[in-house]
Interface confidence: medium
Amino acid sequence: TEVKVIQPEKSVSVAAGDSTVLNCTLTSLLPVGPIRWYRGVGQSRQLIYSFTTEHFPRVTNVSDATKRSNLDFSIRISNVTPEDAGTYYCVKFQRGSPDTEIQSGGGTEVYVLAK
Protein backbone atom coordinates (compact mmCIF):
# COMPACT_ATOMS: atom_id res chain seq x y z
CA THR A 1 0.00 0.00 0.00
CA GLU A 2 1.04 3.58 -0.62
CA VAL A 3 3.10 5.29 2.07
CA LYS A 4 1.16 7.78 4.20
CA VAL A 5 2.67 10.90 5.75
CA ILE A 6 0.82 11.74 8.95
CA GLN A 7 0.87 15.15 10.62
CA PRO A 8 -1.68 14.76 13.42
CA GLU A 9 -1.70 18.39 14.60
CA LYS A 10 -3.57 20.89 12.47
CA SER A 11 -1.92 23.75 14.35
CA VAL A 12 0.41 24.60 17.19
CA SER A 13 0.85 27.86 19.11
CA VAL A 14 4.24 28.84 20.51
CA ALA A 15 5.53 31.93 22.28
CA ALA A 16 8.36 33.80 20.59
CA GLY A 17 11.68 32.56 21.95
CA ASP A 18 10.31 29.13 22.93
CA SER A 19 10.63 25.79 21.16
CA THR A 20 7.95 23.74 19.42
CA VAL A 21 7.76 20.22 18.04
CA LEU A 22 6.12 19.51 14.69
CA ASN A 23 5.06 15.87 14.55
CA CYS A 24 5.34 13.70 11.47
CA THR A 25 5.31 9.93 11.09
CA LEU A 26 5.37 7.68 8.06
CA THR A 27 3.56 4.37 7.65
CA SER A 28 6.48 2.95 5.66
CA LEU A 29 10.03 3.82 4.64
CA LEU A 30 9.40 2.55 1.11
CA PRO A 31 9.97 3.63 -1.54
CA VAL A 32 13.52 4.64 -0.67
CA GLY A 33 14.02 8.39 -0.63
CA PRO A 34 14.43 11.44 1.58
CA ILE A 35 11.97 13.15 3.90
CA ARG A 36 12.00 16.94 3.99
CA TRP A 37 10.11 19.66 5.85
CA TYR A 38 8.91 22.77 4.02
CA ARG A 39 7.12 25.95 5.02
CA GLY A 40 4.46 26.92 2.50
CA VAL A 41 3.52 25.29 -0.78
CA GLY A 42 4.31 25.64 -4.47
CA GLN A 43 7.33 27.31 -6.04
CA SER A 44 7.86 29.66 -3.12
CA ARG A 45 7.99 27.00 -0.41
CA GLN A 46 11.03 27.12 1.85
CA LEU A 47 13.09 24.09 2.86
CA ILE A 48 13.13 23.97 6.67
CA TYR A 49 14.80 20.64 7.35
CA SER A 50 16.11 17.64 5.46
CA PHE A 51 16.92 14.34 7.16
CA THR A 52 20.42 14.23 5.67
CA THR A 53 23.84 15.52 6.69
CA GLU A 54 22.87 19.16 6.05
CA HIS A 55 22.87 21.52 9.03
CA PHE A 56 19.85 23.66 9.75
CA PRO A 57 20.25 26.26 12.52
CA ARG A 58 17.51 26.09 15.20
CA VAL A 59 15.89 22.98 13.66
CA THR A 60 16.68 19.47 14.90
CA ASN A 61 15.18 16.01 14.50
CA VAL A 62 13.33 14.66 17.53
CA SER A 63 14.22 10.99 17.15
CA ASP A 64 17.14 9.16 15.55
CA ALA A 65 16.28 9.11 11.87
CA THR A 66 19.34 6.95 11.11
CA LYS A 67 17.79 3.92 12.83
CA ARG A 68 16.49 1.51 10.21
CA SER A 69 13.07 1.02 11.78
CA ASN A 70 12.45 4.68 12.61
CA LEU A 71 9.24 6.11 11.18
CA ASP A 72 9.25 9.32 13.24
CA PHE A 73 10.36 12.38 11.29
CA SER A 74 9.24 15.03 13.76
CA ILE A 75 11.32 18.18 14.13
CA ARG A 76 11.94 20.69 16.90
CA ILE A 77 12.24 24.38 16.09
CA SER A 78 14.10 26.31 18.79
CA ASN A 79 14.06 30.01 19.65
CA VAL A 80 10.95 30.59 17.52
CA THR A 81 10.56 34.05 15.96
CA PRO A 82 7.49 35.71 14.40
CA GLU A 83 9.04 34.99 10.99
CA ASP A 84 8.62 31.26 11.68
CA ALA A 85 4.83 31.52 11.47
CA GLY A 86 3.26 29.60 8.60
CA THR A 87 2.14 26.15 7.53
CA TYR A 88 4.74 23.39 7.64
CA TYR A 89 4.60 20.26 5.52
CA CYS A 90 6.40 16.98 6.01
CA VAL A 91 7.11 15.57 2.53
CA LYS A 92 8.26 12.13 1.40
CA PHE A 93 10.31 11.82 -1.81
CA GLN A 94 11.31 8.88 -3.97
CA ARG A 95 15.01 8.78 -4.71
CA GLY A 96 15.91 9.60 -8.30
CA SER A 97 17.50 12.19 -10.56
CA PRO A 98 15.86 14.38 -9.48
CA ASP A 99 14.02 13.10 -6.40
CA THR A 100 10.23 12.90 -6.92
CA GLU A 101 7.71 14.11 -4.34
CA ILE A 102 5.25 11.27 -3.70
CA GLN A 103 3.33 12.18 -0.56
CA SER A 104 2.84 15.18 1.72
CA GLY A 105 1.38 15.45 5.18
CA GLY A 106 -1.72 17.56 5.71
CA GLY A 107 0.28 20.48 7.10
CA THR A 108 0.65 22.00 10.55
CA GLU A 109 0.11 25.72 10.99
CA VAL A 110 2.48 27.42 13.43
CA TYR A 111 1.14 30.45 15.26
CA VAL A 112 3.76 32.59 17.02
CA LEU A 113 2.52 34.46 20.07
CA ALA A 114 4.15 37.60 21.42
CA LYS A 115 6.20 36.92 24.56
Partner: antibody, heavy 119, light 108 residues
Framework: DVQLVESGGGVVRPGESLRLSCAAS????????MNWVRQAPGEGLEWVSL????????YYADSVKGRFTISRDNSKNTLYLQMNSLRAEDTAVYYC????????????WGLGTLVTVSS | ETVLTQSPGILSLSPGERATLTCRAS??????LAWYQEKPGQAPRLLIY???SRAAGIPDRFSGSGSGTEFTLTISSLQSEDFAVYYC??????????FGGGTKVEIK
Amino acid sequence: DVQLVESGGGVVRPGESLRLSCAASGFTFSTSDMNWVRQAPGEGLEWVSLISGSGEITYYADSVKGRFTISRDNSKNTLYLQMNSLRAEDTAVYYCAKENDRYRFFDYWGLGTLVTVSS
Amino acid sequence: ETVLTQSPGILSLSPGERATLTCRASQSVYTYLAWYQEKPGQAPRLLIYGASSRAAGIPDRFSGSGSGTEFTLTISSLQSEDFAVYYCQQYYDRPPLTFGGGTKVEIK
Protein backbone atom coordinates in the same frame (compact mmCIF):
# COMPACT_ATOMS: atom_id res chain seq x y z
CA ASP B 1 -22.86 29.15 23.38
CA VAL B 2 -21.95 27.05 20.33
CA GLN B 3 -25.01 25.99 18.34
CA LEU B 4 -25.27 23.82 15.23
CA VAL B 5 -28.74 23.37 13.68
CA GLU B 6 -29.20 21.00 10.75
CA SER B 7 -32.10 21.18 8.30
CA GLY B 8 -33.12 19.87 4.89
CA GLY B 9 -33.72 16.21 5.69
CA GLY B 10 -36.71 14.35 4.38
CA VAL B 11 -37.96 11.39 2.36
CA VAL B 12 -36.70 10.96 -1.21
CA ARG B 13 -36.64 8.20 -3.82
CA PRO B 14 -33.45 6.43 -4.91
CA GLY B 15 -31.56 8.49 -7.50
CA GLU B 16 -32.98 11.80 -6.26
CA SER B 17 -31.12 14.71 -4.65
CA LEU B 18 -31.28 16.59 -1.38
CA ARG B 19 -29.36 19.49 0.13
CA LEU B 20 -28.69 19.64 3.85
CA SER B 21 -27.82 22.85 5.69
CA CYS B 22 -26.21 23.51 9.06
CA ALA B 23 -26.58 26.95 10.64
CA ALA B 24 -23.72 27.70 13.03
CA SER B 25 -23.42 30.27 15.80
CA GLY B 26 -21.41 30.98 18.94
CA PHE B 27 -17.92 30.55 17.44
CA THR B 28 -15.74 31.87 14.61
CA PHE B 29 -17.21 29.80 11.81
CA SER B 30 -14.84 30.98 9.07
CA THR B 31 -11.76 29.55 10.80
CA SER B 32 -13.31 26.25 11.87
CA ASP B 33 -13.06 23.02 9.89
CA MET B 34 -16.50 21.43 9.66
CA ASN B 35 -17.73 17.89 9.06
CA TRP B 36 -20.77 15.81 8.28
CA VAL B 37 -21.13 12.53 10.18
CA ARG B 38 -24.06 10.14 9.71
CA GLN B 39 -25.73 7.33 11.59
CA ALA B 40 -27.85 4.74 9.82
CA PRO B 41 -30.76 3.27 11.82
CA GLY B 42 -29.40 0.89 14.46
CA GLU B 43 -25.81 1.46 13.29
CA GLY B 44 -22.76 3.35 14.53
CA LEU B 45 -21.35 6.71 13.54
CA GLU B 46 -19.80 7.08 10.08
CA TRP B 47 -17.73 10.07 9.00
CA VAL B 48 -18.96 11.48 5.67
CA SER B 49 -17.08 14.63 4.72
CA LEU B 50 -14.80 17.43 5.90
CA ILE B 51 -14.27 21.00 4.69
CA SER B 52 -11.57 23.41 5.81
CA GLY B 53 -12.40 26.83 7.25
CA SER B 54 -11.65 28.58 3.97
CA GLY B 55 -13.55 25.98 1.97
CA GLU B 56 -10.47 25.23 -0.16
CA ILE B 57 -9.87 21.70 1.14
CA THR B 58 -12.47 18.94 1.13
CA TYR B 59 -12.37 15.22 1.92
CA TYR B 60 -15.01 12.52 1.43
CA ALA B 61 -15.63 8.99 2.60
CA ASP B 62 -15.29 6.48 -0.24
CA SER B 63 -18.96 5.56 0.13
CA VAL B 64 -20.12 9.06 -0.96
CA LYS B 65 -17.27 10.23 -3.20
CA GLY B 66 -18.54 11.55 -6.52
CA ARG B 67 -22.14 11.80 -5.27
CA PHE B 68 -21.95 14.19 -2.31
CA THR B 69 -20.48 17.71 -2.26
CA ILE B 70 -19.65 19.61 0.90
CA SER B 71 -19.55 23.42 0.80
CA ARG B 72 -19.88 26.43 3.06
CA ASP B 73 -20.90 30.07 3.00
CA ASN B 74 -18.84 31.87 5.62
CA SER B 75 -20.82 35.08 5.14
CA LYS B 76 -23.93 33.18 6.28
CA ASN B 77 -22.22 30.91 8.85
CA THR B 78 -23.75 27.95 7.04
CA LEU B 79 -22.44 24.52 6.06
CA TYR B 80 -24.03 22.49 3.24
CA LEU B 81 -24.11 18.92 1.98
CA GLN B 82 -25.41 18.43 -1.55
CA MET B 83 -26.43 14.78 -1.93
CA ASN B 84 -27.02 13.44 -5.43
CA SER B 85 -27.83 9.96 -6.74
CA LEU B 86 -29.13 8.96 -3.34
CA ARG B 87 -29.28 5.28 -2.43
CA ALA B 88 -31.21 3.32 0.20
CA GLU B 89 -27.96 2.88 2.15
CA ASP B 90 -27.67 6.67 2.54
CA THR B 91 -30.68 6.57 4.90
CA ALA B 92 -29.38 8.00 8.17
CA VAL B 93 -29.41 10.85 10.63
CA TYR B 94 -26.89 13.39 9.35
CA TYR B 95 -24.98 15.38 11.96
CA CYS B 96 -23.05 18.58 11.43
CA ALA B 97 -19.93 18.60 13.65
CA LYS B 98 -17.39 21.29 14.45
CA GLU B 99 -13.76 20.23 14.63
CA ASN B 100 -11.45 21.23 17.41
CA ASP B 101 -9.06 23.99 16.31
CA ARG B 102 -5.92 21.91 16.83
CA TYR B 103 -6.97 18.30 16.24
CA ARG B 104 -9.50 16.41 14.15
CA PHE B 105 -11.92 15.47 16.88
CA PHE B 106 -15.38 16.97 17.19
CA ASP B 107 -16.00 19.31 20.08
CA TYR B 108 -19.57 20.26 19.13
CA TRP B 109 -22.36 18.46 17.26
CA GLY B 110 -25.84 19.33 16.07
CA LEU B 111 -28.97 17.31 16.83
CA GLY B 112 -29.02 15.91 13.30
CA THR B 113 -31.52 15.73 10.46
CA LEU B 114 -33.05 12.50 9.16
CA VAL B 115 -32.68 11.52 5.51
CA THR B 116 -34.79 8.58 4.31
CA VAL B 117 -34.20 7.13 0.86
CA SER B 118 -37.01 4.78 -0.08
CA SER B 119 -38.97 3.79 -3.14
CA GLU C 1 -7.61 3.02 7.13
CA THR C 2 -7.43 2.59 10.88
CA VAL C 3 -10.12 0.22 12.16
CA LEU C 4 -11.41 0.69 15.72
CA THR C 5 -13.03 -2.24 17.52
CA GLN C 6 -15.07 -1.58 20.67
CA SER C 7 -15.94 -4.17 23.28
CA PRO C 8 -18.21 -5.27 24.71
CA GLY C 9 -21.05 -4.42 22.32
CA ILE C 10 -23.48 -4.20 25.24
CA LEU C 11 -22.67 -3.69 28.92
CA SER C 12 -25.48 -4.38 31.41
CA LEU C 13 -24.81 -2.76 34.78
CA SER C 14 -26.62 -1.25 37.75
CA PRO C 15 -26.40 2.36 38.91
CA GLY C 16 -23.38 2.84 41.17
CA GLU C 17 -21.35 0.14 39.42
CA ARG C 18 -18.10 0.71 37.55
CA ALA C 19 -18.16 0.53 33.74
CA THR C 20 -15.07 -0.35 31.70
CA LEU C 21 -15.25 0.11 27.93
CA THR C 22 -12.46 -0.90 25.56
CA CYS C 23 -11.41 0.41 22.16
CA ARG C 24 -8.71 -1.32 20.12
CA ALA C 25 -7.04 0.20 17.04
CA SER C 26 -5.75 -1.84 14.11
CA GLN C 27 -2.56 0.24 14.17
CA SER C 28 -1.02 2.69 16.60
CA VAL C 29 -2.86 5.99 16.94
CA TYR C 30 -0.55 7.09 19.80
CA THR C 31 -2.88 9.09 22.08
CA TYR C 32 -4.96 10.66 19.32
CA LEU C 33 -8.21 9.14 20.48
CA ALA C 34 -11.53 10.67 21.58
CA TRP C 35 -14.62 9.25 23.31
CA TYR C 36 -18.21 10.44 22.74
CA GLN C 37 -21.52 9.79 24.47
CA GLU C 38 -24.73 9.51 22.48
CA LYS C 39 -28.28 9.52 23.83
CA PRO C 40 -31.51 9.29 21.81
CA GLY C 41 -32.71 12.69 20.63
CA GLN C 42 -29.56 14.46 21.82
CA ALA C 43 -26.44 15.66 20.05
CA PRO C 44 -23.39 13.42 20.59
CA ARG C 45 -21.18 14.82 23.35
CA LEU C 46 -17.39 14.87 23.52
CA LEU C 47 -16.20 13.24 26.75
CA ILE C 48 -12.48 12.58 26.36
CA TYR C 49 -9.78 13.65 23.92
CA GLY C 50 -6.07 12.89 23.79
CA ALA C 51 -6.99 9.47 25.22
CA SER C 52 -7.16 10.82 28.79
CA SER C 53 -8.11 14.54 28.86
CA ARG C 54 -11.66 15.32 29.97
CA ALA C 55 -13.57 17.81 27.84
CA ALA C 56 -14.99 20.94 29.48
CA GLY C 57 -17.90 20.23 31.81
CA ILE C 58 -17.43 16.45 31.90
CA PRO C 59 -17.74 14.98 35.43
CA ASP C 60 -14.62 13.38 36.90
CA ARG C 61 -16.30 9.97 37.15
CA PHE C 62 -15.39 9.68 33.46
CA SER C 63 -11.74 8.85 32.78
CA GLY C 64 -9.78 7.65 29.78
CA SER C 65 -6.51 5.80 29.53
CA GLY C 66 -4.30 3.99 27.06
CA SER C 67 -2.03 4.68 24.11
CA GLY C 68 -0.97 3.00 20.90
CA THR C 69 -3.63 0.42 20.09
CA GLU C 70 -5.43 -0.19 23.40
CA PHE C 71 -7.71 2.33 25.10
CA THR C 72 -10.16 2.30 27.98
CA LEU C 73 -13.03 4.55 29.04
CA THR C 74 -13.98 4.09 32.69
CA ILE C 75 -17.09 5.39 34.42
CA SER C 76 -16.28 5.00 38.11
CA SER C 77 -19.84 4.98 39.45
CA LEU C 78 -22.70 4.86 36.96
CA GLN C 79 -25.39 7.51 37.30
CA SER C 80 -28.81 7.20 35.68
CA GLU C 81 -27.84 9.76 33.03
CA ASP C 82 -24.79 7.70 31.99
CA PHE C 83 -26.81 4.92 30.37
CA ALA C 84 -26.13 5.63 26.70
CA VAL C 85 -24.04 4.53 23.72
CA TYR C 86 -20.31 5.35 23.74
CA TYR C 87 -18.07 5.69 20.70
CA CYS C 88 -14.32 6.01 20.29
CA GLN C 89 -12.80 7.93 17.37
CA GLN C 90 -9.21 8.13 16.17
CA TYR C 91 -7.87 11.40 14.75
CA TYR C 92 -4.26 10.43 14.21
CA ASP C 93 -4.59 9.20 10.65
CA ARG C 94 -5.79 11.84 8.20
CA PRO C 95 -9.26 11.35 6.69
CA PRO C 96 -11.10 9.05 6.67
CA LEU C 97 -11.64 9.71 10.36
CA THR C 98 -12.90 6.47 11.88
CA PHE C 99 -15.20 5.56 14.75
CA GLY C 100 -15.56 2.37 16.69
CA GLY C 101 -18.82 0.42 16.43
CA GLY C 102 -20.02 1.64 19.82
CA THR C 103 -20.74 0.16 23.25
CA LYS C 104 -24.26 0.40 24.69
CA VAL C 105 -24.31 0.77 28.48
CA GLU C 106 -27.75 -0.36 29.61
CA ILE C 107 -29.46 -0.76 32.97
CA LYS C 108 -29.29 -4.30 34.32
